[in-house]
Each structure stands twice: as C-alpha cells, then as structure tokens.
C-alpha cells in the first residue's frame, strides 16, 4: 500500500522559518504534488506550492523555495513574517497524485516539545485516499 510521509522542521537560525519535507512510498509515477497548510488541500487548507515533474513549480507566499529532492520526495522552505507567518502548531499537508495508485495525502506538524533546529520524525499517518 502506498504511503506519504511528512516531516516538519523549524530552523534554529530563523525561528519563523520552516522546512517541510514530504515523500511518496509507492511504485507509481508521480504526476503532481500539492503542499498546503491549515489542513488538507480542498478541506480548508491553503495551497503553498504545486510541483509538476514535467511543467515546473508554482509557489505562493510565505513559501520561499519549493523543489524536488528526488523523483518521489520534495521539500519546501517557508519564510514567515507578519500575518502569514507559520506557527509551531501549524499543520502542513502533502498530496501526491500518482499513476496508477491515485491521490494520497498525509499531514504533519512540529511536535510541541521540539526545540528549534530539531525536526519531527517522518510521519506516514494519517493517510487519506482521495481518488
């Protein structure tokens, strides 16, 4: 069964800067990745970035740098300032569209006890099927 993992890290040097890493554990070919915050995309979440392997990358503030790390994982750096700044309990979600598995999404946030510079362990749950 395919899985999506999400890792959230607060940068020690900039306390309002977050790095989100997401990956897809499956055998299919990824056709689109959507990163959102505040909940799953389409369910109250706000899109931060969309990554298409053959067309490119689109991002919206406060996203600063979205990129592919591997064929099946991405990373996104958020730079917060003012009203658009993420906070420690913000939920980030990654949705992978893959053929033939369909769409798979997982969400994660920084653990309340995390110190700056530490990261949440990759969490494959919860996984939502959204074909």
């Amino acid at each position: 069964t395919p899985e999506v993992w999400v890792q959230v890290r607060m940068e020690a040097t900039e306390l309002s800067s977050f790095t989100i890493r997401c990956g897809f554990l499956g055998s299919g070919s990824i056709s689109l990745v959507t990163v959102s915050w505040g909940g799953p995309n389409g369910a109250g979440g706000t899109t931060l970035a969309v990554l298409h392997p053959e067309r490119g990358i689109r991002q919206w503030a406060p996203a600063r740098q979205a990129r592919w790390e591997t064929q099946s994982s991405i990373s996104l750096i958020l730079e917060g300032s003012g009203a658009s700044s993420p906070c420690a309990n913000t939920t980030f979600c990654c949705k992978f569209a893959s053929f033939p598995e369909g769409s798979w999404e997982a969400c994660g946030s920084l653990p309340p006890s995390s110190d700056p510079g530490l990261s949440a362990p990759p969490t494959p749950a919860p996984i939502l099927r959204a074909d």
Epitope: V50, L51, H52, P53, E54, R55, G56, I57, R58, Q59, Q65, R67, W68, T70, Q71
Partner: nanobody, 118 residues
Framework: EVQLVESGGGLVQPGGSLRLSCAAS????????MGWYRQAPGKDRELVAT???????KYVDSVKGRFTISRGDAKNSVYLQMNSLRAEDTAVYYC????????????WGQGTMVTVSS
Amino acid sequence: EVQLVESGGGLVQPGGSLRLSCAASETYFDLYVMGWYRQAPGKDRELVATITYTGSIKYVDSVKGRFTISRGDAKNSVYLQMNSLRAEDTAVYYCNADPSGLGRKVYWGQGTMVTVSS
C-alpha cells in the same frame, strides 16, 4: 509541452558582445532550471551556463568572467550576455529547461547560431 524560443544570435567580431534571449511557453509554473548549451561544428553539445528559479548559477570554466546568465522579469525567460567573444565561442547555442531539476523531462530550443569571426 513546453516550447522554448531563442533569439539574439548572429555574426560578431572577436572581442565583441551578444545577448541571447530565450522565452518559454510555460507561464503558470516556474521552470526549476533554465540554461544554455552550445554545440560547435564537429563537437559534442556542452553546458555553457544554468540558473535555477531560486538564482543558483553554474558556468563552464571557459566562459567564467565573460558570460553572464540571468532570468528575466518575464516568467520563464533566460538571457545570456556574452562579452569578450572569441573564435572558439562559435557554435549553435541552445536554450534548455528542466522543469523539475531532476532531468525527468528536459526541453530544448531550436538553437541560434553565434559566429565569432573577423
């Protein structure tokens, strides 16, 4: 399918300058890497310079200090300012785009000829 259209090639004397331009048809997504390659007669195609959408730049050693790559205000446009041109810079220059930066899908322009000769 992303289309790349180059312009700016031509005949120039040694020591002269040219500015190459490349515009991509993709206007919604940012192309992660755009760059320039060249192919001289009888030689393999070689990297000249690349630039990511975050501004990371690479040059081949032979053009460092003479060529400058940049991305324009217009989405997914890339430029190559070529100064102090030499005869060995004569080649067909190709615009290149790698939307993901992983090489999964790479696009090429049709090429523009640069001839450096007196």
